[in-house]
């Protein structure tokens, strides 16, 4: 098999084995077989024989020619015919990429999550490049000057004890595989400004049966930051458009926000919180449903108003790890 | 008409093994090679490995080289596809397809297995 080929010759690409999605590529295949005189020189790709635009182009070597290439990846080899063999005669093997040089890394952010001890640091990579691309990500102090590099596939954690050149700094992302380079602008940061506050959770839900039903959602965050602001956005499972209330929050205590909402009807609801005054969010929370009760029709005998309306009857919603939010990653 | 089946996925630990199966019926002598593709959420389709009836007998991408293994059991129609030291940049549906030279590539394909490489 091909698994650590011994090769009877050689195998090689023109412009090169990773080259640029599209472009027009030869493969060249040069027979080296003791005692053998190639009557036909085969090409496979993924193990399937091709049949045209192969060119002989002496005794021992023939080229394959393959315009606008678009496959990311495939495994090519090539093979003999030799005169007094029933097989054919593996000559040898090589994969080829194709791909896309690396687009400018733009939207780099960076932020502390409250207790991870990470700065984390991601950023829009751009169109695919179906390659392996790799990214360096530059971080150097502004009181010190003194500059780290952290090498990913992705996005970075840098810990936070890492940082020991002060508040200050500056972030920026090269790209680079092996088609190209790139480099993103340069994001100034202060620790102080990035840490987004733990983890606002809904924990329950409770429709009551007063005159006019209430609705009261209690969530809470375990964060040690005083000035905490705010969103929770709430609709109908059947609408589209979402309404927003804000809050400014101490979180010493379980929160608990009232709504006046339709009966019978679904609703989600979600959480998110920022340092008051700091540039980056949360991400949403998960969802949260809660169904409204039906409403109890109102007549005027007081007997049936008081074993409906005052019986402080509730239907409540526990959180049990609903579904996650499509919108998690929206810190911005 | 080639119809093909696979089965054997399933979820293993980092450094664990598996092997898949794919089981043809129908015109399976109108094939000359059948593979294995992968195809991982948000890539694009990746050739691992194929077999061929005669001539050289497998090849692999360069991704599984030395893990992976290729068979074919021709009294039982089925290829197999043994997977060894699995990284969690292996998991992904493993497609079984079968080509022909004639058409210049895989015309057949199956529905996929599951394959999740995870702690």
């Known amino acids: 098999g091909i698994t650590n080929i011994n090769c009877s010759g050689h195998i090689w690409v023109e412009p090169a084995t990773i080259f640029k999605m599209g472009m027009n590529i030869s493969i060249y295949c040069q027979a080296a077989i003791k005692n053998c005189q190639p009557r036909k020189l085969h090409f496979y790709k993924n193990g399937i024989k091709e049949r045209f635009q192969i060119t002989r182009i002496n005794k021992t070597t023939a080229r394959l020619w393959y315009k606008n290439f678009l496959e990311p990846h495939a495994s090519m080899y090539c093979t003999a015919e030799c005169p007094k063999h029933f097989q054919e005669t593996l000559i040898c093997g090589k994969d080829i990429s194709s791909g896309y040089p690396p687009d400018i890394p733009d939207e780099v952010t960076c932020v502390i999550y409250e207790y991870s001890g990470n700065m984390t640091c991601t950023w829009n990579a751009g169109k695919l490049t179906y390659i392996d691309t790799k990214y360096v990500v530059h971080v150097k102090s502004l009181e010190t000057e003194e500059e780290q590099q952290y090498l990913t596939s992705s996005y970075i954690n840098i810990s936070t004890d890492s940082l020991q050149g002060g508040k200050k700094y500056l972030v920026w992302v090269q790209a680079a595989n092996a088609l190209g380079m790139e480099e993103s602008k340069q994001l100034q940061i202060h620790l102080d400004d990035i840490v987004i506050p733990s983890a606002a959770v809904i924990s329950r839900a409770e429709t009551i049966n007063a005159t006019v039903p209430k609705t009261i959602i209690y969530w809470d965050s375990q964060t040690t930051i005083e000035k905490v602001s705010c969103e929770m956005r709430y609709k109908a499972t059947t609408n589209q458009t979402w309404n927003v209330k804000e809050f400014d929050t101490n979180f010493t205590y379980v929160q608990q926000s009232e709504f006046y909402l339709e009966p019978n009807i679904k609703y989600v609801f979600q959480v998110r919180c920022q340092e008051t005054g700091k540039r980056y969010w949360q991400p949403w929370s998960s969802l949260f449903f809660h169904k409204t009760p039906e409403t109890v029709p109102q007549v005027t005998s007081k007997a049936f108003q008081h074993d409906t309306w005052n019986s402080g009857l509730t239907v409540a919603s526990i959180s049990t790890g609903h579904l996650t939010s499509d919108n998690r990653g929206d810190i911005g | 008409e080639v119809q093909l089946v696979e089965s054997g996925g399933g979820l293993v630990q980092p450094g664990g093994s598996l092997t898949l199966s794919c089981v043809a019926s129908?015109?399976?002598?109108?094939?000359?090679?059948m593979g294995w593709f992968r195809q991982a959420p948000g890539k694009e389709r990746e050739f691992v490995a194929a077999h061929r009836r005669n001539g050289i007998s497998t090849v692999y991408a360069a991704s599984v080289k030395g893990r992976f293994t290729i068979s074919r059991d021709n009294a039982k129609n089925t290829v197999y596809l043994g997977m060894k030291s699995l990284k969690p940049e292996d998991t992904a549906v493993y497609v079984c397809a079968a080509g022909s030279d004639a058409s210049g590539g895989y015309d057949y394909w199956g529905q996929g297995t599951q394959v999740t490489v995870s702690s």
């Open positions: 129908g015109r399976t002598f109108s094939t000359d090679v």
